[in-house]
């Protein structure tokens, strides 16, 4: 049960995380005009990865897309690339993890295949989360650098008579959404990897052992119990008798090589 819960929770957390990464990537408020210690203006500027916007004091907002590719800063292009890679990996990870979910039955898929898929999706979520965190952090670093540069040159003018106030930008909401979403995707990925360990059938070194109990015929083979779920490595090796109802994840004692002398 714990494995299913861990896998399911990992999937949900990653799903929320990837939705957050997509939202952050699409948001316009990656950087917002710094209002602290600045003259109050009738306009408010904010910028995203794809367009910049100006909101008048009336609330009327006008946005302009960045219709150039070559004219954009390399750092912005890098952030875009990281976010898109994060989204693509996350989306593929979600697709893979849906089929890997223990609670979903697809034909006669083996447990080892589910375990592998869970691990694959987990790794994809981890990389996706790291991409998002890296992208957001690169952008944040760019903002901090520009902020202090514009603070140093805040007032430039002709003989101090005419002043030009440079618009300074600070962290926008999208950065925080991106950090949280990237973190959630990362956590979801780790949970999937942990779940994978519980899903993988245990490798045993002994050969199949058979014994006859009076009145009952029970054939034990490695992976025998798992086979009863219909997901096992060999569906022909189903346990003929199960002495009591058990849940799929309940601990099953396998015969140890030390049990037979």
């Amino acid at each position: 049960m714990a494995v299913t819960a861990c896998q399911g929770l990992g999937f949900v957390v990653s799903l929320i995380g990837i939705a957050g990464i997509i939202a952050a990537t699409c948001m316009d408020q990656w950087s917002t005009q710094d209002l602290y210690n600045n003259p109050v203006t009738a306009v408010f500027n904010y910028q995203g990865l794809w367009r910049s916007c100006v909101r008048e004091s009336s609330g009327f907002t006008e946005c302009r897309g960045y219709f150039t590719l070559l004219g954009l800063p390399a750092m912005l292009q890098a952030v875009r690339a990281l976010m898109i890679v994060g989204i693509v990996l996350g989306a593929i990870g979600l697709l893979v993890s849906i089929f890997a979910l223990k609670c979903i039955r697809i034909g006669s898929m083996e447990d080892s295949a589910k375990a592998n898929m869970t691990l694959t999706s987990g790794i994809m979520f981890i990389v996706s989360g790291l991409c998002a965190i890296a992208g957001v952090s690169v952008f944040a670093n760019m903002l901090v650098t520009n902020f202090w540069m514009s603070t140093a040159n805040m007032y430039t003018g002709m003989g101090g008579m005419v002043q030009t106030v440079q618009t300074r930008y600070t962290f926008g909401a999208a950065l925080f959404v991106g950090w949280v979403a990237g973190g959630l995707t990362l956590i979801g990925g780790v949970m999937m990897c942990i779940a994978c360990r519980g899903l993988a059938p245990e490798e045993t070194n002994y050969k199949a052992v058979s014994y006859h109990a009076s009145g009952h015929s029970v054939a034990y083979k490695p992976g025998g119990f798992k086979a009863s779920t219909g997901f096992g490595s060999n569906t022909k090796n189903k346990k003929i008798y199960d002495g009591g109802a058990r849940t799929e994840d309940e601990v099953q004692s396998y015969p140890s090589k030390h049990d037979y002398v």
């Epitope: 109050v40 004091s57 609330g59 009327f60 005419v162 106030v165």
Partner: antibody, heavy 119, light 113 residues
Framework: QITQKESGPGILQPSQTLSLTCSLS??????????VGWIRQPSGKGLEWLAH???????YYNTALKSRLTISKDTSNNQVFLKIASVDTADTATYYC???????????WGQGTLVTVSA | DIVMTQSPSSLTVTAGEKVTMSCKSS????????????LTWYQQKPGQPPKLLIY???TRESGVPDRFTGSGSGTDFTLTISSVQAEDLAVYYC?????????FGSGTKLEIK
């Protein structure tokens, strides 16, 4: 047709509170991005912005007069009000009410109302 | 507060002449976000309220004759009337609509010979 008509007391004494009303027609105060402002002009002098209010109740005041100014609106009656506390003779002017554009400029002006502060 | 300085304070021209008047602001009115200059020009004829002519430094309000042209960027702005008509007799004001408090210039009085 967009019109705005200002009304005021005409004459009042120093230290009293000046109450001005701007009655609007041709547009609604609840419409997105609509704003109404007050500007005054002493006789033969220049224009001075006092305050304005937006459709979403955002208010902006002239910092030099902020402590004495109160702007408000009554959306149902399509009216904007301005109160100026503790008036003195320097407040004698023609007071204009104006509708604002999407930005902080004034697109349509009323005819103005002359207010005289006299002892 | 932003100081708006208009020059000349008055000028007298003959009908049909080209006229230019200047407005300077103590700080740049150019918004980096949209590259627009937040400066507005008004015309106030004797005994009338002001009338909007130009906003965003160069965008003519609908119904304003095309002989009125606004130009300039940053801190220096100009209003040009290409061919003055008798009805252009008025005081022209510029307004900073970028920084609060909103401020007006002292005006340029245009007189016709």
């Amino acid at each position: 047709q967009i019109t705005q008509k200002e009304s005021g007391p005409g004459i009042l004494q120093p230290s009293q509170t000046l109450s001005l009303t701007c009655s609007l027609s041709g547009f609604s105060l609840s419409t997105y991005f609509i704003g109404v402002g007050w500007i005054r002009q002493p006789s033969g002098k220049g224009l001075e912005w006092l305050a304005h209010i937006w459709w979403n109740d955002n208010k902006y005041y002239n910092t030099a007069l902020k402590s004495r100014l109160t702007i408000s609106k009554d959306t149902s009656n399509n009216q904007v009000f301005l109160k100026i506390a503790s008036v003195d003779t320097a407040d004698t002017a023609t007071y204009y009410c104006a509708r604002m554009g999407s930005g902080a400029w004034f697109t349509y002006w009323g005819q103005g109302t002359l207010v005289t502060v006299s002892a | 507060d932003i100081v708006m300085t208009q020059s000349p304070s008055s000028l007298t021209v003959t009908a049909g002449e080209k006229v230019t008047m200047s407005c300077k602001s103590s700080q740049s009115l150019l918004n980096s976000g949209n590259q627009k200059n937040y400066l507005t020009w008004y015309q106030q004829k004797p005994g009338q309220p002001p009338k909007l002519l130009i906003y965003w430094a160069s965008t003519r309000e609908s119904g304003v004759p095309d002989r009125f042209t606004g130009s300039g960027s940053g801190t220096d702005f100009t209003l040009t009337i290409s061919s003055v008509q008798a009805e252009d007799l008025a005081v022209y004001y510029c307004q900073n609509d970028y920084y609060y408090p909103l401020t007006f210039g002292s005006g340029t009085k245009l007189e016709i010979k």
